[in-house]
Amino acid sequence: IWELKKDVYVVELDWYPDAPGEMVVLTCDTPEEDGITWTLDQSSEVLGSGKTLTIQVKEFGDAGQYTCHKGGEVLSHSLLLLHKKEDGIWSTDILKDQKEPKNKTFLRCEAKNYSGRFTCWWLTTISTDLTFSVKSSRGSSDPQGVTCGAATLSAERVRGDNKEYEYSVECQEDSACPAAEESLPIEVMVDAVHKLKYENYTSSFFIRDIIKPDPPKNLQLKPLKNSRQVEVSWEYPDTWSTPHSYFSLTFCVQVQGKSKREKKDRVFTDKTSATVICRKNASISVRAQDRYYSSSWSEWASVPCS
Amino acid sequence: RAVPGGSSPAWTQCQQLSQKLCTLAWSAHPLVGHMDLREEGDEETTNDVPHIQCGDGCDPQGLRDNSQFCLQRIHQGLIFYEKLLGSDIFTGEPSLLPDSPVGQLHASLLGLSQLLQPEGHHWETQQIPSLSPSQPWQRLLLRFKILRSLQAFVAVAARVFAHGAATLSP
């Protein structure tokens, strides 16, 4: 058993049929010695008396808010949550496996630049009685500070018969050094509580591996005289790290016909313009990637050829 | 050229060669992003290779103030990786494929380090400790980890030379 926060405790249980469970001793936080009784949740049934209460925690029915009273007065509370371990593996019932980039990916994180700011998100089908708490650091043995905000519900989607909820959190490294080469990964830890079930999820990454620039901005076409060619120009996204002479991007320019089956013409360039042939009903798209480190491409920015 | 004492390197040549190094490092291990090395408990390897750190003066401001600190740091790292790529981790069994870019990568590391320190000029003699002997089954993972770290190292070096070529060239 360990303390998650004041008056909230997590009991770690090996979860299998007829498991013995864990013996837990609760102590009433009071100077009083006599006349103390214990109840669980809203029930008025007295579970025991005295300053301490010893319970055998085996299942969710044994978890909940234990309260000690004297007379009609509440003295203190202890909320017990359960953390299940099945076949040596901690349960992951609360969050959905996103399966990208690999199985058992519950947390996904992205950064728009090298400033040390990043966003993580996760999915669940649970809509109520759900709380999250997020902590982060750079390195684990001698951790350096990363500050995370509160997790918020950022999207709701319908997937077949189910509703899916996306939560996200923004974090910022306290003393980020955008130009340095990271040697210690960022660690992100999410505590999830659904009713009386506790679970924790972790992710470990270098900012450089989760970079995904915003799409190029101000995408414009300029027809070239007496030609089917156009000059496409664009600018670095506002959110990308500066100076651009140091934090450089490379770009992919694509000409795509109306039909998905039509051949795509692609040009790669380090410049912020390119000359391409504009076919009727086609569109021109541009996306960006770090020039020197192959992290994710941005989403496409597009304009129609006409 | 980055001669100890302070004259400038051939920024544009360094930019071109460092960008080539980035390409080679990724082509030597293109699928690197799909394997989570931290699951392999690779702290020792990542701790054992060079890193361009915050105080090394490789940020735009540091380069403007005095690029020599950063260039020396990059030079040290290039020599270090060149020695690793020339060791039995890469030359031993299992043999690399004949068209593997590792050979080119090795030569380019040497080429860039020589651009930074031409004959007759010396920062300090580069020493690296004796390498632990490795067995074929260990080498595949070590190669993977070294290339993964090298990709991050040369990315920073390439940014430095690109910025230098754009803003510090005579």
């Epitope: - | 020792e44 390897t45 054992d48 270090f80 990786y81 400790p129 632990s132 002997p133 067995q135």
Partner: antibody, heavy 120, light 113 residues
Framework: QVQLQESGPGLVKPSETLSLTCTVS????????VHWIRQPPGKGLEWIGV???????DYNPSLKSRVTISRDTSKNQFSLKLSSVTAADTAVYYC??????????????WGQGTLVTVSS | DIVMTQTPLSLPVTPGEPASISCKPS????????????LAWYLQKPGQSPQLLIY???TRQSGVPDRFSGSGSGTDFTLKISRVEAEDVGVYYC?????????FGQGTKLEIK
């Protein structure tokens, strides 16, 4: 917890072969190299040799012609053999481990040592 | 072989006073690529096996009191004890693991005055 324990005869006759065993527990021998070090009575420490995680060995050049280090992974045991011993080989013999990495590490855990006396 | 020269060989100290031991290898133990010095410090208490105090010249092993500190780089290293306690008596050794064969200093015997 991590343990290394040396064992073997405490007395060996001159010109014979000294044989010691180091039994380890609490760590994976595929992640650690195991070294032998000795200390003559009242003197300093001398590195004898190492067996690497991959099974290859390196020895101190001053002892190389007489030393063999091997291991039995199924038993989590390492052995040291030192042939043609003389009184100068009388020492406390230690085994110690270092974490496998690109470069050899420092010894973080040692056995308690076993005294071997060479005498007729 | 890298020769490790330790001084002094004997060090009598009054409890509560500081102590300092020097170790000078015959060649540099600094790998400038990764900025590590391949040097460790050990304490061998009477009748015991050596125990690790400091690795990579300046990193304290977990569980080692913070009165022990290591410093130096290249060919000049120092182990300092800020305030010697009775339990610190024993022989202190430096070890280089930069090149084969590993070599130790001759040892410094710290005793209480």
């Amino acid at each position: 917890q991590v343990q290394l324990q040396e064992s073997g005869p405490g007395l060996v006759k001159p010109s014979e072969t000294l044989s010691l065993t180091c039994t380890v527990s609490g760590f994976s021998i595929s992640s650690y190299n195991v070294h032998w070090i000795r200390q003559p009575p009242g003197k300093g420490l001398e590195w004898i040799g190492v067996i690497w995680t991959g099974g290859s060995t390196d020895y101190n050049p001053s002892l190389k012609s007489r030393v063999t280090i091997s291991r039995d992974t199924s038993k989590n045991q390492f052995s040291l053999k030192l042939s043609s011993v003389t009184a100068a080989d009388t020492a406390v013999y230690y085994c110690a481990r270092d974490k496998y990495g690109l470069f050899p590490g420092y010894f973080d855990y040692w056995g308690q040592g076993t005294l071997v006396t060479v005498s007729s | 072989d890298i020769v490790m020269t330790q001084t002094p060989l004997s060090l009598p100290v009054t409890p509560g006073e500081p102590a300092s031991i020097s170790c000078k290898p015959s060649q540099s133990l600094l790998s400038s690529g990764n900025r590590k010095n391949y040097l460790a410090w050990y304490l061998q208490k009477p009748g015991q096996s050596p125990q690790l105090l400091i690795y990579y010249a300046s990193t304290r092993q977990s569980g080692v009191p913070d009165r022990f500190s290591g410093s130096g780089s290249g060919t000049d290293f120092t182990l300092k004890i800020s305030r010697v306690e009775a339990e610190d008596v024993g022989v202190y050794y430096c070890l280089q693991h930069f090149n084969y064969p590993w070599t130790f200093g001759q040892g410094t015997k710290l005793e209480i005055k």
